[in-house]
């Protein structure tokens, strides 16, 4: 928060924190995981590390009507430069190459952890 | 759900060379670091060798170190292990598996069988 004349002004989240917050989403994800996420919805995959939040919104923007990932979906918005819609394919995907939602989850967790720790928040 | 098949493996003679491969799918492999595990008959587990993600980190046992090269294909989900200069010693059962610190990400493939002998 910046604070201006005594009133407190939300300023721009820093990396560092939106990444940590949508880490702590992801981790809430998969503890509190139940039934199969997204009823066993299959995502494309991703095959390099380079345009990472823009090729895991494009994975998950497909998945419809599952409530467990719309706030990832909306936080992953937030590091992707440009808008994107369901349909929408990167070559950062495996075209032929679907998995799990619950195990695209995961992985991106672990990425994102690695990426906190190396401090690369953008 | 997630599946490591290793391949390449088989009867050679001392010094000569074989290539390990292991195809991976049902996880996001470009994100994990990965390993070549083996046990020789009657031992243990023993790493060979781990490569990171990205493919510029790697670590070799001091016993393989200068004849085995690890290496990995992220566009294909494929780890390799090109194995050179084989002894009879480097006689194991190999498993790809992911390198990964963190708990509840590991995962180990079937093994492929490797026999040095004349």
């Known amino acids: 928060l910046t604070c201006l004349g005594g009133f407190a002004s939300p300023g721009p989240v820093p990396p560092s924190t939106a990444l940590r917050e949508l880490i702590e989403e992801l981790v809430n994800i998969t503890q509190n995981q139940k039934a199969p996420l997204c009823n066993g919805s299959m995502v494309w995959s991703i095959n390099l590390t380079a345009g990472m939040y823009c090729a895991a919104l494009e994975s998950l923007i497909n998945v419809s009507g599952c409530s467990a990932i719309e706030k990832t979906q909306r936080m992953l918005s937030g590091f992707c430069p440009h808008k994107v819609s369901a349909g929408q394919f990167s070559s950062l995907h495996v075209r032929d190459t679907k998995i799990e939602v619950a195990q695209f989850v995961k992985d991106l967790l672990l990425h994102l952890k690695k990426l906190f720790r190396e401090g690369q928040f953008n | 759900g997630v599946q490591l098949l290793e391949s390449g493996g088989g009867l050679v003679q001392p010094g000569g060379s074989l290539r390990l491969s292991c195809a991976a799918s049902?996880?996001?492999?470009?994100?994990?670091?990965m390993g070549w595990v083996r046990q020789a008959p009657g031992k243990g587990l023993e790493w060979v060798s781990r490569i990171g993600a990205h493919g510029n980190v790697t670590y070799y046992a001091d016993s393989v170190k200068g004849r085995f090269t690890i290496s990995r294909d992220n566009s294909k989900n494929t780890l390799y292990l090109q194995m050179n200069s084989l002894r009879a010693e480097d006689t194991a059962v190999y498993y790809c598996a992911t390198a990964e610190d963190e708990p509840g990400y590991d995962y180990w493939g079937q093994g492929t069988l490797v026999t040095v002998s004349s």
């Open positions: 049902g996880f996001i492999f470009a994100w994990y670091d």
